[in-house]
Interface confidence: medium
């Protein structure tokens, strides 16, 4: 079965006008000696194993949280954007237990 890594919105620093990055300052494990990690770009799983995962939506990968999710088309919701809404949902069940 496919393992989905959920995504959360990366927050912005309040000094964003001085810093073009939308990510918080982070400490990345491994450092310079982490098998040349600095020069190795991580593969986007949306282009590989999650390519066809989102049914009515677009796969999104947020690298700084190592997380994948589906950005749903307007009328769809759910983990894979597979459920169609009859009306606006003010409350969505967040329990994504497998």
């Amino acid at each position: 079965s496919v393992r989905v890594e959920q995504v959360v919105k990366p927050p912005q620093n309040k000094t964003e006008s001085e810093n073009t990055s939308d990510k918080p300052k982070r400490k990345k494990k491994g450092g310079k000696n982490g098998k040349n990690r600095r020069n190795r770009k991580k593969k986007n799983p949306c282009n590989a194993e999650f390519q066809n995962f989102c049914i009515h939506g677009e796969c999104k990968y947020i690298e700084h949280l190592e997380a994948v999710t589906c950005k749903c088309q307007q009328e769809y919701f759910g983990e894979r954007c597979g459920e169609k809404s009859m009306k606006t949902h003010s409350m969505i069940d967040s329990s994504l237990s497998k």
């Epitope: 890594e5 959920q6 959360v8 990366p10 927050p11 990345k28 494990k29 997380a67 999710t69 589906c70």
Partner: antibody, heavy 124, light 112 residues
Framework: EVKLVESGGGLVKPGGSLKLSCAAS????????MSWVRQTPEKRLEWVAT????????YYPDSVKGRFTISRDNAKNTLYLQMSSLRSEDTAMYYC?????????????????WGQGTSVTVSS | DIVMTQPPLSLPVSLGDQASISCRSS???????????LHWYLQRPGQSPKLLIY???NRFSGVPDRFSGSGSGTDFTLKISRVEAEDLGVYFC?????????FGGGTKLEIK
Amino acid sequence: EVKLVESGGGLVKPGGSLKLSCAASGFTFSSYPMSWVRQTPEKRLEWVATISTGGTYTYYPDSVKGRFTISRDNAKNTLYLQMSSLRSEDTAMYYCARQGPIYYGNYYYAMDYWGQGTSVTVSS
Amino acid sequence: DIVMTQPPLSLPVSLGDQASISCRSSQSLVHSDGNTYLHWYLQRPGQSPKLLIYKVSNRFSGVPDRFSGSGSGTDFTLKISRVEAEDLGVYFCSQSTHVPYTFGGGTKLEIK
């Protein structure tokens, strides 16, 4: 049912160290970023640390940076907080919290489930 | 850091009444993506905080519809249309638009 159970708290002297653990169940632990939040004796809530799903990226406020280390073991469904150079102002109830998105058109960043907490007292 | 202010510290209400809890941030909480990452939590006596409202006005799973959130920019409000006994506790607002993430000091909802 999402369940988060913290342990490892206790009484420690200033300058000492302590390692907190949080056992997670009821959801796919490896799929969620996780955080630690503390509540001071005055009942103020303070964000302490956040870790990405795979543990590669960690985030801290300046107040604990360099002293606290958040980590996770996805095979054991466990989150950790290693605390060193402890100060009296670190005295608090420490909560483990899931960064759980509800996705409907776009995502948000909030702590949707919290454990019951473990108490840390730093005193000589 | 963004300062979240929640006056008053205590809000006495009668059961069945409407309650209104305010939260003000020291800077705008509108993210560059257009969203406002302002959330509300309830901490009942002896319990851990529970998420009630996310992104200003969206009720979390299982939260009764008597709870509603509103506001924009720097001023936000949580309304409880008919207060029930289980609603008593401390309400915290929280922002995750800016790093570090910060919380308000809390407003205690108690019986008049």
